[in-house]
Interface confidence: low
C-alpha cells in the first residue's frame, strides 16, 4: 500500500509538471505571437506610411510634370509672342521707312515743280514784258532794234518764284503722299497697325478744301493691332492728342464712322480733351513689368533683340546732286535705370 | 512487485508524454518563429522598396522642381525680353517718325529757300532792268514821266520776300506727307500698318487742293508672322537698314548720351507740346513705372535697351544743294536662336 501511494504521488507530480509545461509553452507561444504581432504592426504601419508618402510624391510629381508641360508650352508661346512682336514692329518700321522715302521723293518733285514753274513764270512774264516794251518803244522812238536788244536779256534770267508762280502754285497743289491704311481692303495680312502722327501747325485764313480732300486721321486713339503708336514725337501741342490711347473725344466721329477728320482749329479741342493727359507717359515703352528685369545672358539679349536681323533698304537715291541729309543713326546711351 | 511494475510503466509513459509535449512545443515555437521571420522579411523588404521608391520620387520631384524653377525664370526672361522688344521697336519707330518730321521740315525750308532765292533774283533783276529801261527811255523821248509810270509796277516786284512771295507761299500748300497705306489692295502680307504722318506748316489763304491728288503707296508683302525679315521691301541697297538696332557705331554718341538731339529750334516746340509735358519722359521710355525700377548692371541696361541706346542726330544737313539721304548704321543680321 505504501509503495502504491508512493508511485501515485510520483505520477501526480509528473502530471502537474506536464500541466505546468503545457501552460508555460502556451504562454511562451502567446508571448512570441504578441511580440511578432506588435512588430508586424509597426512594419505594416511603416509600409502604409511609405505607401501614402509614395502616393503623395507621385501626385506631386504628376502635378509638377503637368505644370512643367504647361510651362514649356508657355515658353513656346512666348517664343511665338516674341516672333509676333518682331513681325508687327518690323513691319511698322519698314512702313515708316517707306513713307519716309515717299516724303523725300515728293519733296524732290515739289522742289523741281517749284523751280520749273518759277522758270516758266519768268519766261512767260519776260516774253510778255518784251512784247510790251517793244510796243512802248515803237511808239516812242526810231531806233527800235537797239531797244529791243536791250529787252532781250529778260528771257534769259530765271525768276525763281514770282507772281505767276504764286498763282500757278495755288492751282496745282504739290503732290501729297497721303497714305491711308484701310484694313477693310487688306488681304493676306496679319494685323492692322495704325500709327498716326499728325503734325499740323495752326492755319489761318485757310480756304476750304475741295471735297474729298480732308485730312483724315483714322482711329485717333489707337495704334492698330500690334502697335499703339510710338507717336507723340514732338508734335505741336495742337495735335498731340492725335495718338492718345486714352478716351479722348470718343464722340468725335468722322465721316466714315471710323475716320476722324481734324478740321482747322480743332487741334486745341483735342488736346484739351485728354482727361489725364498730363499724366500720360510717352508711348512706346508700355507694358513693362520692371520687377521682372533681371540679369540677362547674351542668349537672352539676342532673344530679346530678335528681329533686328533685317536689312531695310531705304531711300532709293534719285539724284546725288542735291542736299545730303545724313540720318546719323547714332546710338544713345540712355541712362535710365531699369 | 506487479503493482510496482505497473506504476513504473505508468510513470515511464508519462515521462515519454512529457518529452513528446516538450518537443512538440519546441517545434511549434520554431515554426511560429520561422513563419513570423518570413513574414517580417517580406514586410521589411516592402519597407525598403518603399523607401527606395520614396527616395527616387523625392529626387525626381527635386529635379523637376529645379527645372520648373528654371523654366519659370525663362518665362520671366521671355516676358522681359518681350517688353524689351516692345520698347526697342517703339523707340525705333519713334525715331523714324521723328526723322520723317525732320525730312518734312527740311523740305519746307528748302522750298522756301528756293522760292525766296527765285523772288530775290526776280526782284533784283527787275530793279536793274527798271533802271536800265528808265535810262534808255529817257534817252529816247520826252514824255519820261509817263514812261516811268509805265515802268513802276516793275519796281514793286519784291526784294527778297514781298507781296509776290507772300502770295505764292500762301497759295502753295505745304507738302503734306500724309502717308497712307491702302491695305485693301495689299496682297500676301501679314499686317496692316496705318502709319499716318501729317506735317503741315502754317498756311494762310490756302486755296482748295485738287481732288484725287493723293499718292498711294501700296503695302508690299512684308515679314510675316514669324518674321522672316521686314526687309523684303524692294528698296535700293544704297541705304539699307535705316533704323538698325545693331550695336554698330557705338561710339557715335550724341551730346548728352542720354538725350535725343533735336535739330534747329525744335526744342521749344517739343517743350510746348503737351499740357503735362514736363512730366513726360524722353521718347522711347514710355509706360515706365519708375518706382519699380531697381538698379541694373550696365550689361543688363544694354540688354534691355538693345538698339534703343542711340542718339539720332536727325538730318544733319551738310549741303543744301544735294539730296542723298544716307541712312547710316546698317542692321546686322542676327542669327538669334530663341
Amino acid at each position: 500500500e505504501l509503495k502504491k501511494n508512493e508511485f501515485q504521488g510520483e505520477l501526480e507530480k509528473q502530471r502537474e509538471q506536464l500541466d505546468k509545461i503545457q501552460s508555460s509553452h502556451n504562454f511562451q507561444l502567446e508571448s512570441v505571437n504578441k511580440l511578432y504581432q506588435d512588430e508586424k504592426a509597426v512594419l505594416v504601419n511603416n509600409i502604409t506610411t511609405g505607401e501614402r508618402l509614395i502616393r503623395v510624391l507621385q501626385d506631386q510629381l504628376k502635378t509638377l510634370q503637368r505644370n512643367y508641360g504647361r510651362l514649356q508650352q508657355d515658353v513656346l508661346q512666348f517664343q511665338k509672342n516674341q516672333t509676333n512682336l518682331e513681325r508687327k514692329f518690323s513691319y511698322d518700321l519698314s512702313q515708316c521707312i517707306n513713307q519716309m522715302k515717299e516724303v523725300k521723293e515728293q519733296c524732290e518733285e515739289r522742289i523741281e515743280e517749284v523751280t520749273k514753274k518759277g522758270n516758266e513764270a519768268v519766261a512767260s512774264r519776260d516774253l510778255s514784258e518784251n512784247n510790251d516794251q517793244r510796243q512802248q518803244l515803237q511808239a516812242l522812238s526810231e531806233p527800235q532794234p537797239r531797244l529791243q536788244a536791250a529787252g532781250l536779256p529778260h528771257t534769259e534770267v530765271p525768276q525763281g518764284k514770282g507772281n505767276v508762280l504764286g498763282n500757278s502754285k495755288s492751282q496745282t497743289p504739290a503732290p501729297s503722299s497721303e497714305v491711308v491704311l484701310d484694313s477693310k481692303r487688306q488681304v493676306e495680312k496679319e494685323e492692322t497697325n495704325e500709327i498716326q502722327v499728325v503734325n499740323e501747325e495752326p492755319q489761318r485764313d485757310r480756304l476750304p478744301q475741295e471735297p474729298g480732300r480732308e485730312q483724315v486721321v483714322e482711329d485717333r486713339p489707337v495704334g492698330g493691332r500690334g502697335f499703339g503708336g510710338a507717336g507723340e514725337l514732338g508734335q505741336t501741342p495742337q495735335v498731340q492728342a492725335a495718338l492718345s490711347v486714352s478716351q479722348e473725344n470718343p464722340e468725335m466721329e468722322g465721316p466714315e464712322r471710323d475716320q476722324l477728320v481734324i478740321p482747322d482749329g480743332q487741334e486745341e479741342e483735342q488736346e484739351a480733351a485728354g482727361e489725364g493727359r498730363n499724366q500720360q507717359k510717352l508711348r512706346g515703352e508700355d507694358d513693362y513689368n520692371m520687377d521682372e528685369n533681371e540679369a540677362e545672358s547674351e542668349t537672352d539679349k539676342q532673344a530679346a533683340l530678335a528681329g533686328n536681323d533685317r536689312n531695310i533698304d531705304v531711300f532709293n537715291v534719285e539724284d546725288q546732286k542735291r542736299d545730303t541729309i545724313n540720318l546719323l543713326d547714332q546710338r544713345e546711351k540712355r541712362n535710365h535705370t531699369l | 512487485e506487479l503493482k510496482k511494475n505497473e506504476f513504473q510503466g505508468e510513470l515511464e509513459k508519462q515521462r515519454e508524454q512529457l518529452d513528446k509535449i516538450q518537443s512538440s512545443h519546441n517545434f511549434q515555437l520554431e515554426s511560429v518563429n520561422k513563419l513570423y521571420q518570413d513574414e517580417k522579411a517580406v514586410l521589411v523588404n516592402n519597407i525598403t522598396t518603399g523607401e527606395r521608391l520614396i527616395r527616387v520620387l523625392q529626387d525626381q520631384l527635386k529635379t523637376l522642381q529645379r527645372n520648373y524653377g528654371r523654366l519659370q525664370q525663362d518665362v520671366l526672361q521671355f516676358q522681359k525680353n518681350q517688353t524689351n522688344l516692345e520698347r526697342k521697336f517703339s523707340y525705333d519707330l519713334s525715331q523714324c517718325i521723328n526723322q520723317m518730321k525732320e525730312v518734312k521740315e527740311q523740305c519746307e525750308e528748302r522750298i522756301e529757300e528756293v522760292t525766296k532765292k527765285g523772288n530775290e533774283a526776280v526782284a533784283s533783276r527787275d530793279l536793274s532792268e527798271n533802271n536800265d529801261q528808265r535810262q534808255q527811255l529817257q534817252a529816247l523821248s520826252e514824255p519820261q514821266p509817263r514812261l516811268q509810270a509805265a515802268g513802276l509796277p516793275h519796281t514793286e516786284v519784291p526784294q527778297g520776300k514781298g507781296n509776290v512771295l507772300g502770295n505764292s507761299k500762301s497759295q502753295t500748300p505745304a507738302p503734306s506727307s500724309e502717308v497712307v497705306l491702302d491695305s485693301k489692295r495689299q496682297v500676301e502680307k501679314e499686317e496692316t500698318n496705318e502709319i499716318q504722318v501729317v506735317n503741315e506748316e502754317p498756311q494762310r489763304d490756302r486755296l482748295p487742293q485738287e481732288p484725287g491728288r493723293e499718292q498711294v503707296v501700296e503695302d508690299r508683302p512684308v515679314g510675316g508672322r514669324g518674321f522672316g525679315g521686314a526687309g523684303e521691301l524692294g528698296q535700293t541697297p544704297q541705304v539699307q537698314a535705316a533704323l538698325s538696332v545693331s550695336q554698330e557705331n557705338p561710339e557715335m554718341e550724341g551730346p548728352e548720351r542720354d538725350q535725343l538731339v533735336i535739330p534747329d529750334g525744335q526744342e521749344e516746340e517739343q517743350e510746348a507740346a503737351g499740357e503735362g509735358r514736363n512730366q513726360q519722359k524722353l521718347r522711347g521710355e514710355d509706360d515706365y513705372n519708375m518706382d519699380e525700377n531697381e538698379a541694373e548692371s550696365e550689361t543688363d541696361k544694354q540688354a534691355a535697351l538693345a538698339g534703343n541706346d542711340r542718339n539720332i542726330d536727325v538730318f544733319n544737313v551738310e549741303d543744301q544743294k544735294r539730296d542723298t539721304i544716307n541712312l547710316l548704321d546698317q542692321r546686322e543680321k542676327r542669327n538669334h536662336t530663341l
Epitope: Q77, T83, K189, G228, E285, D286 | Q79, E86, S90, G226
Partner: antibody, heavy 122, light 111 residues
Framework: DVKLVESGGGLVKPGGSLKLSCAAS????????MSWVRQTPEKRLEWVAT????????YYPDSVKGRFTISRDNAKNTLYLQMSSLKSEDTAIYYC???????????????WGQGTTLTVSS | EIVMTQAAFANPVTLGTSVSISCRSS???????????LYWYLQKPGQSPQLLIY???NLASGVPDRFSSSGSGTDFTLRISRVEAEDVGIYYC????????FGGGTKLEIK
C-alpha cells in the same frame, strides 16, 4: 480662381453712349492683355477691342473704330469699354476676356466673363 | 478680313457615337512658323464660350481627349469621339492669324 465680372450694360438709344466695366480677380491683371468680345442676338461672336497689359497697344475692328475706346486701370484691376454713337447693330452680350499670356495680342481668349447685355433701341 | 465659315447645325447625334464639325477659312491659317492659327470654342447653353482647341490641334487644359481637331490650312474638322450629354452647345471656330474673327457657330444637338 480667375474671375471676370462685367457690368454697365443696359438699354441705350441710338447715338447714345455707355461705359462697360470688367472687374478682374484671381490673377495678376497687369500681366495680361485683355479684350472685349461681343455676341449678337443671332449668337455670332465678334471681337470688339484689345488692350495690351500696360495700355499702349490698342486694337479695334473697323466696325467699332472711332466709336469705342478700350482702357484699363491696372491699379483697380478693371477693364473698360467706352462706347459712343451707338447703333442698333451694337446690341449684344459683351464679354470681358483675358488673353492667354501677357504681351502678345494674337492669342486666344482663355477666360471669359459671364457677359453684360447692351440693347440699343429707340 | 479672314472669313470663317461653319454650318449652322451639325447632324443630330446619338450619345456615345462620334461627330465631326467643319470649318473653312477664306485664307490659309498656316503660318510660315509652322503654326496654324485656328481655335475652337464651345459655348454650352447659358454659359460663356470656353476654349477647346488652340493652334488647330492642341487640346486646352481640362478638355477631355474625346475632342480632337485636324485640318489643312483652310479646312478644319473638330471631332468628338464619344459624344456625351454635356457636349451640346454651339461650337465656334476662330482664327487669329489676323485680327480675330469667329465662324458663325455650329449647333450640336443630341437625338
Amino acid at each position: 480662381d480667375v474671375k471676370l465680372v462685367e457690368s454697365g450694360g443696359g438699354l441705350v438709344k441710338p447715338g447714345g453712349s455707355l461705359k462697360l466695366s470688367c472687374a478682374a480677380s484671381g490673377f495678376t491683371f497687369s500681366s495680361y492683355t485683355m479684350s472685349w468680345v461681343r455676341q449678337t442676338p443671332e449668337k455670332r461672336l465678334e471681337w470688339v477691342a484689345t488692350i495690351s497689359r500696360g495700355g499702349t497697344y490698342i486694337y479695334y475692328p473697323d466696325s467699332v473704330k472711332g466709336r469705342f475706346t478700350i482702357s484699363r486701370d491696372n491699379a483697380k484691376n478693371t477693364l473698360y469699354l467706352q462706347m459712343s454713337s451707338l447703333k442698333s447693330e451694337d446690341t449684344a452680350i459683351y464679354y470681358c476676356t483675358r488673353e492667354y499670356f501677357s504681351g502678345d495680342t494674337y492669342d486666344y481668349f482663355d477666360y471669359w466673363g459671364q457677359g453684360t447685355t447692351l440693347t440699343v433701341s429707340s | 478680313e479672314i472669313v470663317m465659315t461653319q454650318a449652322a447645325f451639325a447632324n443630330p447625334v446619338t450619345l456615345g457615337t462620334s461627330v465631326s464639325i467643319s470649318c473653312r477659312s477664306s485664307k490659309s491659317l498656316l503660318h510660315s512658323n509652322g503654326i496654324t492659327y485656328l481655335y475652337w470654342y464651345l459655348q454650352k447653353p447659358g454659359q460663356s464660350p470656353q476654349l477647346l482647341i488652340y493652334q488647330m490641334s492642341n487640346l486646352a487644359s481640362g478638355v477631355p481627349d474625346r475632342f480632337s481637331s485636324s485640318g489643312s490650312g483652310t479646312d478644319f474638322t473638330l471631332r468628338i469621339s464619344r459624344v456625351e450629354a454635356e457636349d451640346v452647345g454651339i461650337y465656334y471656330c476662330a482664327q487669329n492669324l489676323e485680327l480675330y474673327t469667329f465662324g458663325g457657330g455650329t449647333k450640336l444637338e443630341i437625338k
